[in-house]
């Protein structure tokens, strides 16, 4: 059986693999997929007092 | 911006099947995960399942073998079945969607559900 | 499952003043050097508004008022300063290690 939500993860610490260009890790399943199907945190406005994070899932450079 | 709106009934006999639907709009289904969390009265929340842009499901082990969460894509709707209920399952139930670490930023009203003979 | 307790379950503090919620994980909630614990704010019948994510991290639309820090297991939600709208239940939940959980609640009141 599949483990539980351990996934949503974004790209701030290394992947447990490598995706290619246009994918990004999920890591519940385990396995590269499109970025399109993972959603990301809103944008925060211009001014916000919090930095904003780096967790765009973007694909492993 | 993403919307969720559950609905289903008010009231359902201990033993019976509850039966939720979760409509979503400003998002597709086939992107993201699609969690059912429940609020007992005394406040406890408690996180039930997902299911993902895949159908992959997960379930809470509390939950056993109860739960089952399926969705119709063409409708963009997910759904909840908790079988052989109990007043123990009386709460408000929501639907809900989670960014990228696992925090749901967006949330249904939630719909109250009581178990009851 | 990993238990995540909140104290104080009830808090009263004076409007303008520091208001400080503790949660502390059974085990660490970090990961790839995240941590993995939100914060919540529900008002009676609403659902839960998210708050803060990643332990610290503002959510977009949330006052600067609210923040976050911790790592491990013990982490902080801090109000400051508290203003009346505040009053509500706050939960810490973790989703480092399924099932995800939450937090038992803490209540805020003014004064």
């Known amino acids: 059986m599949r483990r539980g939500p351990r996934s949503l993860r974004g790209r701030d610490a290394p992947a447990p693999t490598p995706c290619v260009p246009a994918e990004c890790f999920d890591l519940l399943a385990r396995h590269c997929v499109a970025c399109g199907l993972l959603r990301t945190p809103r944008p925060k406005p211009a001014g916000a007092s919090s930095p904003a994070p780096r967790t765009a899932l973007q694909p492993q450079e | 911006e993403v919307q969720l709106q559950e609905s289903g009934p008010s009231l359902v006999k201990p033993s019976q099947t509850l039966s939720l639907t979760c409509s979503v709009t400003?998002?597709?289904?086939?992107?993201?995960?699609w969690n059912w969390i429940r609020k007992f009265p005394g406040n406890k929340l408690e996180f039930m399942g997902y299911i993902n842009y895949s159908g992959t499901t997960y379930y809470n082990p509390s939950l056993k073998s109860r739960i089952s969460i399926t969705r119709d894509t063409s409708k963009n709707q997910y759904y909840l079945q908790l079988n052989s209920v109990t007043t123990e399952d009386t709460a408000t139930y929501y639907c809900a969607t989670p960014h990228t670490y696992g925090a749901m930023d967006y949330w249904g009203q939630g719909t109250t559900l009581t178990v009851s003979a | 499952d990993i238990v995540l307790t909140q104290s104080p379950v009830s808090l009263a503090v004076s409007l303008g003043q520091r208001a400080t919620i503790s949660c502390r994980a059974s085990e660490s909630v970090d990961d790839y050097g995240i941590s993995f614990m939100h914060w919540y704010q529900q008002k009676p019948g609403q659902p839960p508004k998210l708050l803060i994510y990643?332990?610290?991290d503002l959510e977009s639309g949330i006052p600067a008022r609210f923040s976050g820090s911790g790592s491990g297991t013990d982490f902080t939600l801090t109000i400051n300063p508290v203003e009346t709208d505040d009053v509500a239940i706050y939960y810490c939940q973790q989703t480092s290690k399924d099932p995800w959980t939450f937090g038992g609640g803490t209540k805020l009141e003014i004064k």
């Open positions: 990643r332990a610290s």
């Open positions: 400003g998002d597709s289904i086939t992107r993201g995960y």
